[in-house]
């Protein structure tokens, strides 16, 4: 089949824009650390890089292959307010490189870490 | 309480970076349209803008207040492969502005649309 060059160019552009790579995302701090329901953070979210995007096949998953850690200082508020906001320093995982990995390999990797 | 200027500056930066606004995201086309499990798209994902980020309170939700539509041509593949990839044209909702809205208002809005 012969396809229009413009269509092929735009499809190629879509492939590039959606590939598996570190992407800036908003992390809800309370949810990330599973804190008590009466503990709040200001700001409630932080911006970090996490692997995201799409892989070329159903059996592949976009996973981080290297991680750095970013230290951020936020205010922690506990209600009822017996004292003012307390500064807390939190270290966040920041994905620096990613790869499309077989879901089976990911499963094995996770389970070998758990088994250790 | 007196807080270090550096801390306040970095917190302000975090607020700005994580605010509710249109963000570039990857949409898995098959999941978005809930198609049959033997229908695949190449590329499998497209890049569009959707509202995201955090609101200042639990009771608020980041919602789109205006939407444009982006037309993209992809290839659809049905397995088993009895014929080649077929072009499909998809108009994707692309959020152009966002606002933190009360979850109750969002619920009312959605249900008034459904009730119409």
């Amino acid at each position: 089949a012969h396809y229009n060059t413009e269509i092929l160019k735009s499809i190629d552009n879509e492939w590039r824009k959606t590939q598996c790579m570190p992407r800036e995302v908003c992390i809800d701090v309370g949810k990330e650390f599973g804190v008590a329901t009466n503990t709040f953070f200001k700001p409630p979210c932080v911006s970090v890089y996490r692997c995201g995007g799409c892989c070329n096949s159903e059996g592949l998953q976009c996973m981080n292959t290297s991680t750095s850690y970013l230290s951020k200082t936020l205010f922690e508020i506990t209600v009822p307010l017996s004292q003012g906001p307390k500064p807390v320093t939190i270290s966040f995982a920041n994905h620096t490189s990613c790869r499309c990995m077989s879901k089976l390999d990911v499963y094995r990797q996770v389970h070998s870490i758990i088994r250790r | 309480a007196h807080y270090n200027t550096e801390i306040l500056k970095s917190i302000d930066n975090e607020w700005r970076k994580t605010q509710c606004m249109p963000r570039e995201v990857c949409i898995d086309v098959g999941k978005e349209f809930g198609v049959a499990t033997n229908t695949f798209f190449k590329p499998p994902c497209v890049s569009v803008y959707r509202c995201g980020g955090c609101c200042n309170s639990e009771g608020l939700q980041c919602m789109n207040t205006s939407t444009s539509y982006l037309s993209k041509t992809l290839f659809e593949i049905t397995v088993p492969l009895s014929q080649g990839p077929k072009p499909v044209t998809i108009s994707f909702a692309n959020h152009t502005s966002c606002r933190c809205m009360s979850k109750l208002d969002v619920y009312r809005q959605v249900h008034s649309i459904i009730r119409r």
Epitope: - | F33, G34, V35, A36, Y69, I90, S91, F92, A93, I114
Partner: nanobody, 118 residues
Amino acid sequence: QLQLVESGGGLVQPGGSLRLSCAASGSSFSPYAMGWYRQAPGKQRELVAATTSGGSTLYADSVKGRFTISRDNAKNTVYLQMNSLKPEDTAVYYCYMHWRGSDPENYWGQGTQVTVSS
């Protein structure tokens, strides 16, 4: 039990129009996505058109500009307006509805026959 009921199929001359409809009974929630597939004799089932509650729409290039998909959330119904019908549009048309959630589910209609012939 959730059921999808299609109607509107039939015999039509080339260049004519038909409007298919598909209604879901047994669900109080509106599906996230709704759409239509078709299957011609001896051929694979192919995607024709689809729509999401977020306003996105999809059309196979073979029907683009001739077919229009629309939905009525209040009635949990999806429509396919088919204009300028061609003999190659002859097929059984199946609607589907997709509910999102922790366990996404698809439901299918029983199919409605569309025949384009002079």
